[in-house]
C-alpha cells in the first residue's frame, strides 16, 4: 500500500480467484483513543472500532471510503483504491491500446519544435467517474524538471457503437536547450483512477523523436507563362524551431488527381519552393519533416490547382 | 427468530490455540455481515473481529495476526480460530450479527492460564 495523495492510498493486489489480498491497518487521524467506530463509504454498518483498524482487501467491495467517527463526529477519512496485477502484469482497463506505433501504445506524444514543449494523448471508453494527474521528467535516477499541465478532455469520437474519448496534456521541460544533444529520455508517468480502480501508464521519449512539424503554411501557386507548369512556394509554420538555417526541413510536394487511383506525382526539396505540373482537378499538397533526422512528417498543407 | 449458539471455548494456556464455532439460524446468514465481541471479567463488550458478505475480515488491533474469522455459509457457521493466546484474552466470546453485539448468541468461556 502507498499514498497517492493526502488520504488516498492505492493497495496493490494480485488479482486471481480466492487470492488472499492484503491485510491494510488503517489509522484515525485524531488525538482521540476511545470510542472510535469504522464504516466503509455511505453504509452505516460498523465495520469495526479502535484508533487502529486491520483490514482485509481483496476485491473492489472492500475498496472505497473508510471513515472512523465518535459520538457522530466524523474525525477522518481513508480512500483505499485498487491497483490490480494479473499474471504479473498490472492492468490496463481504463486506457485504450492506441497500437500505433507498436501494441501496448497507450499515451502517444508529439512536439513541434525543439523547445522542450509537448503533447502527449491518450484515447478511452470510460466517461464518467475518471480522474487523470500527469508528472514528468526527464531522466529517472536524477531527474529534471518538466512541468505538465492539467490532462483534458480533447475530443470526442463515435466508433461503431462506442463512443471514445481523448484526453490530452501540455508538458514544457523546465530548462530547455533545443540544440542539445540529448541523452537522457524524457519520463512521463500518468495515473489514472476510474471509481475505485487505479492505474499508472508511462512513456519514454527524446524529444527528437516525437517530432512532427506543423504543416507548411502560406501554401501559394504561381502559374508560369505559357506552361502547364506552376510554381508553388510556402513558408517554414510558425512554431518550428528558430533559426531555420540551423533548425532545417525538408519538404514532399505532391499533386493528386481528384480520384485517389490517379497516380500522384511528388518531389522532394529542401528549398521553399518547386515547379510541378498542375493537372485539371488535382490538388497540390506539401509537407514538412526534420532535414537531418527523420521523425515524422507534418500533415499536409493544400491548395486546389484551379 | 435469530438463533446463534457459540461453542469451542475452554480453558488453554498461555500459547495455546482454540476454535470457536457459532451455528446460526433465523436469518440470511449468508448476506449478513458478522462478528465476534467478548466481554472480559468487569469490563464492557469489546469488538473482535468482523467478517463481510465477499469473506474480507477486519480486526481490532489488539488481535495483531493471532486470530482469523471465517465462515462457511453452506453450513450457516460463524468461525473464530484463535492462535497465540494470552492472559489477557480470558473472556466470554460472542458471535453477533451486529457490531454492538445486540444480537448475539450466550457466548463461549475462554480463559487462558497457566
Known amino acids: 500500500i502507498w499514498e497517492l495523495k493526502k488520504d488516498v492510498y492505492v493497495v496493490e493486489l494480485d488479482w486471481y480467484p480466492d487470492a488472499p489480498g492484503e491485510m491494510v491497518v488503517l489509522t484515525c487521524d485524531t488525538p482521540e483513543e476511545d470510542g472510535i467506530t469504522w464504516t466503509l463509504d455511505q453504509s452505516s454498518e460498523v465495520l469495526g472500532s479502535g484508533k487502529t483498524l486491520t483490514i482485509q482487501v481483496k476485491e473492489f467491495g472492500d475498496a472505497g471510503q473508510y471513515t472512523c467517527h465518535k459520538g457522530g463526529e466524523v474525525l477522518s477519512h481513508s480512500l483505499l483504491l485498487l491497483h490490480k496485477k494479473e499474471d504479473g502484469i498490472w492492468s490496463t482497463d481504463i486506457l485504450k491500446d492506441q497500437k500505433e506505433p507498436k501494441n501496448k501504445t497507450f499515451l502517444r506524444c508529439e512536439a513541434k519544435n525543439y523547445s522542450g514543449r509537448f503533447t502527449c494523448w491518450w484515447l478511452t471508453t470510460i466517461s464518467t467517474d475518471l480522474t487523470f494527474s500527469v508528472k514528468s521528467s526527464r531522466g529517472s535516477s536524477d531527474p529534471q524538471g518538466v512541468t505538465c499541465g492539467a490532462a483534458t478532455l480533447s475530443a470526442e469520437r463515435v466508433r461503431g457503437d462506442n463512443k471514445e474519448y481523448e484526453y490530452s496534456v501540455e508538458c514544457q521541460e523546465d530548462s530547455a536547450c533545443p540544440a542539445a544533444e540529448e541523452s537522457l529520455p524524457i519520463e512521463v508517468m500518468v495515473d489514472a483512477v476510474h471509481k475505485l480502480k487505479y492505474e499508472n501508464y508511462t512513456s519514454s521519449f527524446f524529444i527528437r523523436d516525437i517530432i512532427k512539424p506543423d504543416p507548411p503554411k502560406n501554401l501559394q501557386l504561381k502559374p508560369l507563362k505559357n506552361s502547364r507548369q506552376v510554381e508553388v512556394s510556402w513558408e517554414y509554420p510558425d512554431t518550428w524551431s528558430t533559426p531555420h538555417s540551423y533548425f532545417s526541413l525538408t519538404f514532399c510536394v505532391q499533386v493528386q488527381g481528384k480520384s485517389k487511383r490517379e497516380k500522384k506525382d511528388r518531389v522532394f526539396t529542401d528549398k521553399t519552393s518547386a515547379t510541378v505540373i498542375c493537372r485539371k482537378n488535382a490538388s497540390i499538397s506539401v509537407r514538412a519533416q526534420d532535414r537531418y533526422y527523420s521523425s515524422s512528417w507534418s500533415e499536409w498543407a493544400s491548395v486546389p490547382c484551379s | 427468530q435469530v438463533q446463534l449458539v457459540e461453542s469451542g471455548g475452554g480453558l488453554v494456556q498461555p500459547g495455546g490455540s482454540l476454535r470457536l464455532s457459532c451455528a446460526a439460524s433465523?436469518?440470511?446468514?449468508?448476506?449478513?455481515?458478522m462478528y465476534w465481541v467478548r466481554q472480559a471479567p468487569g469490563k464492557g463488550l469489546e469488538w473482535v473481529a468482523t467478517v463481510k458478505t465477499n469473506n474480507s475480515t477486519v480486526y481490532a488491533d489488539f488481535v495483531k495476526g493471532r486470530f482469523t474469522i471465517s465462515r462457511d455459509n453452506a453450513k450457516n457457521t460463524l468461525y473464530l480460530r484463535m492462535n497465540s493466546l494470552k492472559p489477557e484474552d480470558t473472556a466470554l466470546y460472542y458471535c453477533a450479527r451486529d457490531y454492538a453485539g445486540r444480537l448475539r448468541g450466550q457466548g463461549t468461556q475462554v480463559t487462558v492460564s497457566s
Open positions: 433465523g436469518f440470511t446468514f449468508s448476506s449478513s455481515w
